[in-house]
């Protein structure tokens, strides 16, 4: 009686179980009663990453330098090329098909997490006691100057965008 299901790494065709092609190879012809499955290696710029019965391999992704892309991992017959972005840029999607410049954190905001090739800058508002007076993709919020430690007093309060202004203590008149 012909099988209705096959073992792992096999597939059912014409009422019989044929071996799947291993990763890196494509199907040329199904097995028969007398012959094994015939598989062929993917060409140099193609891949298949699973046990399969595909008749065509997939083309390696191209990391186009004109789009700011660079190769993170070269493609092989069993794995696709992995792209990432050049320094100063990050991917616009998970599949990393193009890149955009990292976002800068505006004054009043500091960098919580520096951008990578695959993620943008994460900014956070400067909390009380901290400030940022620049637009930057690297600078964190900086603490207000401590006037007391310099034997000075606060002449102008700080904000999330400006540091405090320190000045000399008023001398008491005799």
């Amino acid at each position: 009686e012909p099988p209705t299901a096959c073992r792992e790494k096999q597939y059912l065709i014409n009422s019989q179980c044929c071996s799947l092609c291993q990763p890196g190879q494509k199907l040329v012809s199904d097995c028969t009663e007398f012959t094994e499955t015939e598989c062929l290696p993917c060409s140099e710029s193609e891949f298949l990453d699973t046990w399969n019965r595909e008749t065509r391999c997939h083309q390696h992704k191209y990391c186009d330098p004109n789009l700011g892309l660079q190769v993170q991992q070269k493609g092989t017959s069993e794995t696709d090329t992995i792209c990432t972005c050049e320094e100063g840029l990050h991917c616009t999607s998970e599949s990393c098909e193009s890149c955009v410049p990292h976002r800068s954190c505006l004054p009043g905001f500091g960098v919580k997490q520096i951008a990578t090739g695959v993620s943008d800058t994460i900014c956070e508002p400067c909390p009380v006691g901290f400030f940022s007076n620049v637009s930057s993709a690297f600078e964190k919020c900086r603490p207000w100057t401590s006037c007391e430690t310099k034997d000075l007093v606060v002449q102008q309060a700080g904000t999330n965008k400006t540091d405090v202004v320190c000045g000399p203590q008023d001398r008491q008149r005799a």
């Epitope: 140099e44 710029s45 390696h60 190769v71 991992q73 092989t76 794995t79 090329t81």
Partner: antibody, heavy 116, light 113 residues
Framework: EVQLVESGGGLVKPGGSLKVSCAAS????????MNWVRQAPEKGLEWIAY????????YYADTVKGRFTISRDNAKNTLFLQMTSLRSEDTAMYYC?????????WGTGTTVTVSS | DIVMTQSPSSLTVTAGEMVTMSCKSS????????????LTWFQQKPGQPPKLLIY???TRESGVPDRFAGSGSGTDFTLTISSVQAEDLAVYYC?????????FGAGTKLEIK
């Protein structure tokens, strides 16, 4: 017999141009990726360019990007490297090498000398 | 770019001795998709083009004598010649075949006493 033979090297002045070729025989040229690798006198190996079997993927080393162009003619089993804006530091032996994941066959090389 | 560091830069041995040379990469050459290390070893004899010895860190190219063996994973790799012959006089290069730009080590020059 699998063979790669480079040609077209020579003496060129700084700022000049040169096109070197690599003739392939003994294998199905259109199945393989191809590369150029150079070696300055008494120095190590430096990969400079790659072109995939179907010409869809091309990569360059930063040292030659914008100055050198790799190309291939699968009908004529030939690989090319067009070099422009040549500098003295481009003086080297230029090898072509075929690849299917690794450089398994190399040519004997052609010498390029950049000097005034 | 991945930096490949080879050591020693040169070594002199007597025929019949065992030799090991090291190659370290500045980042892992292990492809997580297929668990292969994309590290290649070449031999370059004086006046000749390089010749492939080992690919995927440990797979010997056909026709290469079995005295040549590659090992290692991730960032640390070794080429061992179990019994050096006079014809092994050459410079040995390791190469990152994991990502572009493909980069080579500076080489280890093997001299025979």
């Amino acid at each position: 017999e699998v063979q790669l033979v480079e040609s077209g090297g020579g003496l060129v002045k700084p700022g000049g141009s040169l096109k070197v070729s690599c003739a392939a025989s003994g294998f199905t040229f259109s199945d393989y990726g191809m590369n150029w690798v150079r070696q300055a006198p008494e120095k190590g190996l430096e990969w400079i360019a790659y072109i995939s079997s179907g010409r869809s993927n091309i990569y360059y080393a930063d040292t030659v990007k914008g100055r050198f162009t790799i190309s291939r003619d699968n009908a004529k089993n030939t690989l090319f490297l067009q070099m422009t804006s040549l500098r003295s530091e481009d003086t080297a032996m230029y090898y072509c090498a075929r690849s299917w994941g690794y450089f398994d066959v190399w040519g004997t090389g052609t010498t390029v000398t950049v000097s005034s | 770019d991945i930096v490949m560091t080879q050591s020693p830069s040169s070594l002199t041995v007597t025929a019949g001795e065992m030799v090991t040379m090291s190659c370290k990469s500045s980042q892992s050459l292990l492809n997580s998709g297929n668990q292969k290390n994309y590290l290649t070893w070449f031999q370059q004899k004086p006046g000749q083009p390089p010749k492939l010895l080992i690919y995927w860190a440990s797979t010997r190219e056909s026709g290469v004598p079995d005295r040549f063996a590659g090992s290692g994973s991730g960032t640390d790799f070794t080429l061992t010649i179990s019994s050096v012959q006079a014809e092994d006089l050459a410079v040995y290069y390791c190469q990152n075949d994991y990502t572009y730009p493909l980069t080579f080590g500076a080489g280890t020059k093997l001299e025979i006493k």
